[in-house]
């Protein structure tokens, strides 16, 4: 006989274990979305969990597979493209990474009609881009810098452009500066609504000056990537926008588009190109200096076969206080009248709202207001318009689906998420279909995310797409940390922080406090999502306390706190972090002695700063590819915040901000030093001269490099550096292994 | 299993007109996005016209301005009312989801149309 004791009353607790770092690892508490690929109002595809590519009508509540997983299989398949008149769908392979965006990848067309791939005046590969025009089956696509169009698949191509050449000409996709810091995409040709036109960016690199790195690869010899990175200061791409009669392409050819006269006296940028309609375009450029931004309406003269961009339809959008736009400069959302738009842009107390603009910026009228901030505009339709806000209950870190009724005057607001799962969902995104008959909604967190369909008239929930039932039973036994986002007030600055607490937290211990950062202008990293991540192993597993603080420069909070780094990076965001940190002390919970900071990119070049700091409170920290002078990073991306590196502009402050300059007061922390040789975005370069000025010094730190990795440290690298800042971070809080 | 008839199909002159209609029973509603397709002898089957189940019209090029694809929800039917036939218009016609659906019983027997000169 076996006598067994009764269960106890916490037997739950018992079964239940601390998150792993091998948990972290493997992504097993990973969750999954569900974004429909609509393709009219009322139907959209979806890849199956077994790789056929389903259709499914909202309205009659069928679906039924278009494209087999077998047809998927036969070309290696991992992406596809249905044309807009459902006749051919393209299948990419190949996949090939560049940059953040971009890849270059192989595409088979195959015939839905007769079930057989497209034979005949096949596509050339590597292709850089390709995609169908927005009706039809037309396609576009880049192939060695060069653009070409077919009007059926299995027709000859016509080449648009000649000129392309590697590294130096680059029509139709961005080059490496533009991909990262202006357009945040892959592509940069734009089809007219009905495929009448195609407008398209040639970028001319030829006077960039060349980054030049080693890629040790397995020969030999390294292989040395060079790229054209205007560099702070440096020369930048030139740029040009044409604009080609697809149906006719031979007949004029390609068409350059004016550049507005107050733009093109100095150094400028195109942010990006918006259609209206087949024969009206909206283009918007950016001074050097990024503080005029020029919105500019195009007509097409039937006349003349060219683009007319008369200066009453220049809108200009200046900040006096920073920088224009947020992140970057908003892009309008056209009304149904082909002239008007509605676009988000600071009001006059500071905070960016969506605003109409019927006639002039100076006549706009403010649609939203508070202190709060419009965040996205998703769609306007005949009688509404849906954005994201933070407004309510006034938590910056959340995001919420609204509609304003535009069809009735006055104008109503109604919050569409606000009250569906409160509890669960506090950030939304969303995803419409044709005329906004249906949509989405994506729900990040705070707690397991989840993914419904709604009736676009109505609101009304129609299914669940995705609740992620695996990972919320999988996470039943998980002893998950504690999660809050509280907010300090400090010298009439609001410092919101999200913390992250072991699961038996107890406010009369003393824990070790990890701050991570990131910090950089525009960002927020205090918000209300799900994540089970590193951090959240830290604090399950090891009882760290974590904690997260959006300081002066994040976004979100009106443009006093946002623009407050203007001219001046790596001074506040990093005194805000001090502060909060003495902030947490005085909770009386934080062992302070036990205190370490880490960040990545920007959040390495403030972790850096702030530990060479001189406060005397961080005990050690890490800093994976930090920023080390803003002198090493990109133009675009550098100028926006801090202005030219130049005497009679704010050299000065280039050469006070730089990590290296405090190289004599990281001799009392312990500090690792992170970075992958072939990192395209934050170069090596800024870890060397780190390393260099430390060795100079004569100061101890440790350091680890990851060959032939980029910026994301992505594969291997990603466990064998989680690894090995666990270790740092459990050596430098005395925490046993 | 779904059935999918077609109808209206024959002999006709050229720049002469004939209506064809698809039924269907079985699991598959008509209120789908529907499109007829047509494949002439010893030709590949080709996409003719769609329409999705807003309304919204395709049309394959070298049909456009002849043939009109409608539906009536009602009676569960889509129609191709074909006008100005030519010679090049023979072939078997067939109606199927738009785009069609991969199933062994997806498509039917077909209509044929023929179209003297």
């Known amino acids: 006989i076996v006598l067994r004791p009764s269960r106890v009353h916490n037997s739950e607790e018992n079964t239940m274990r601390a998150l792993t770092l091998k948990d972290i690892l493997n992504g097993t508490f990973s969750y999954k979305t569900f974004f429909p690929n609509w393709i009219s109002g009322q139907e959209y595809l979806h890849q199956s969990a077994d790789n056929n590519i389903v259709l499914y009508n909202i309205e009659t509540g069928q679906s039924y597979t278009i494209l087999s997983n077998r047809t998927m299989k036969s070309v290696n398949a991992s992406n596809y493209g249905l044309s807009p008149d459902r006749q051919f769908v393209y299948l990419e392979s190949d996949y090939s990474k560049l940059w953040r965006y971009s890849y270059t990848a192989t595409y088979y067309i195959y015939d839905l009609s007769n079930g057989e791939f497209v034979r005949g005046n096949e596509l050339p590969r590597p292709i850089q881009y390709l995609c169908w025009s927005p009706v039809g089956s037309k396609l576009a696509y880049v192939y060695q810098n060069n653009i070409y169009l077919k009007q059926r698949p299995g027709d000859p191509p016509f080449q648009i452009t000649f000129n392309g050449r590697e590294n130096k000409i680059f029509n139709g996709i961005p080059d490496w500066v533009y991909e990262e810091e202006m357009l945040a995409t892959k592509y940069a040709l734009w089809w007219s609504p009905n495929g009448k036109f195609l407008a398209y960016a040639e970028f001319n690199d030829t006077d960039i000056p060349v980054i030049a790195y080693s890629y040790y690869g397995d020969e030999q010899y390294p292989r040395t990537i060079n790229i054209p990175y205007p560099k702070a200061g440096a020369k930048n791409p030139v740029v040009r926008i044409f604009i080609i009669d697809t149906t006719y392409p031979a007949y004029v050819g390609p068409q350059e588009v004016p550049v507005p006269a107050m733009i093109a006296s100095s150094d400028y940028y195109f942010s990006w190109l918006t259609w209206v309609t087949d024969e009206r375009v909206c283009l918007q450029w950016l001074k050097r200096v990024q503080n005029v931004s020029v919105l500019s309406i195009c007509d097409f003269r039937e006349d003349w076969q060219t683009w007319d961009c008369p200066k009453t339809q220049e809108h200009i959008e200046e900040s006096r206080t920073g920088w224009a736009g947020g992140f970057f400069v908003s892009t309008p959302v056209f009304s149904y009248d082909a002239i008007s738009y509605y676009k988000i842009f600071s009001d006059k107390d500071g905070y960016k709202h969506i605003h109409y603009i019927k006639d002039t910026v100076e006549n706009a009228i403010q649609i939203t207001s508070g202190k709060w901030e419009a965040i996205n505009i998703f769609r306007v339709t005949q009688d509404s318009l849906f954005y994201s806000s933070n407004e309510f209950e006034e938590y910056p870190g959340r995001r919420n689906i609204y509609r304003i009724s535009i069809g009735s005057y006055p104008p109503s607001k109604k919050c569409v998420t606000c009250h569906l799962r409160k509890e669960r969902c506090q950030y939304y995104t969303a995803s419409f279909s044709d005329y906004a008959k249906y949509y989405a909604l994506v729900c990040y967190g705070p707690g397991i995310p989840i993914s419904t369909l709604h009736d676009g008239r109505t609101d009304q929930e129609i299914k669940i797409l995705e609740e992620n039932k695996e990972l919320e039973n999988a996470l039943k036994n998980i002893q998950l940390p504690k999660e809050e986002i509280k907010k300090l007030e400090v010298d009439e600055i609001t410092l919101w922080y999200k913390m992250i607490l072991p699961p038996q937290f107890d406010r009369s211990k003393k824990y070790p406090l990890l701050i991570q950062v990131y910090g950089g202008p525009c960002s927020q990293s205090v918000r209300s999502v799900f994540a089970v991540n590193w951090i959240s192993y830290l604090a399950s597993k090891e009882g760290m306390v974590i904690a997260l603080v959006d300081g002066r420069g994040t976004a979100f909070q009106g443009d006093k706190l946002l623009y407050a780094v203007y001219r001046k990076l790596g001074v506040y965001e990093v005194e805000d972090q001090i502060t909060a940190v003495r902030k947490f002390i005085e909770m009386g919970f934080i062992d302070e002695k036990r205190i370490a900071i880490w960040g990545w990119s920007y959040g390495g070049y403030v972790s850096s700063l702030a530990l060479a700091s001189g406060t005397g409170l961080f005990k050690c920290g890490i800093a994976v590819a930090p920023v080390s002078s803003w002198e090493y990073y990109a133009s675009v991306y550098t100028e926006r915040f801090m202005g030219l590196p130049t005497k009679d502009d704010n050299l000065e402050h280039y050469k006070n901000s730089t990590v290296m300059a405090r190289a004599e007061y990281f001799r009392n922390v312990d500090y690792l030093l992170i970075h992958g040789t072939a990192d395209d975005n934050v170069h090596f370069q800024n870890s060397a001269q780190i390393a260099k000025a430390l060795v100079n010094a004569q100061v101890d730190f440790q350091a680890m490099w990851y060959s032939d990795q980029n910026h994301g440290l992505s594969g291997l690298s990603t466990n064998h550096l989680y690894t090995h800042m666990t270790h740092f971070l459990k050596q430098c809080f005395s925490l046993s292994d | 299993q779904v059935q999918l008839q077609e109808s209206g199909g024959g002999l006709v002159q050229a720049g002469g007109s004939l209506r064809l209609s698809c039924a269907a029973s079985g699991s598959i509603s008509m209120l789908n996005s529907m499109g007829w397709y047509r494949q002439a002898l010893g030709k590949q089957r080709e996409f003719v016209a769609g329409i999705t189940s807003g309304g919204r019209t395709n049309y394959a090029d070298s049909v456009k301005g002849r043939f009109a694809i409608s539906r009536d929800n009602d009676k569960n039917t889509v129609y191709l009312q074909m006008n100005s036939l030519k010679p090049e218009d023979t072939a078997v016609y067939y109606c199927?989801?738009?785009?069609?659906?991969?199933?062994?019983?997806?498509w039917g027997q077909g209509t044929q149309v023929t179209v003297s000169s």
């Open positions: 199927n989801t738009w785009p069609p659906r991969i199933a062994f019983d997806s």
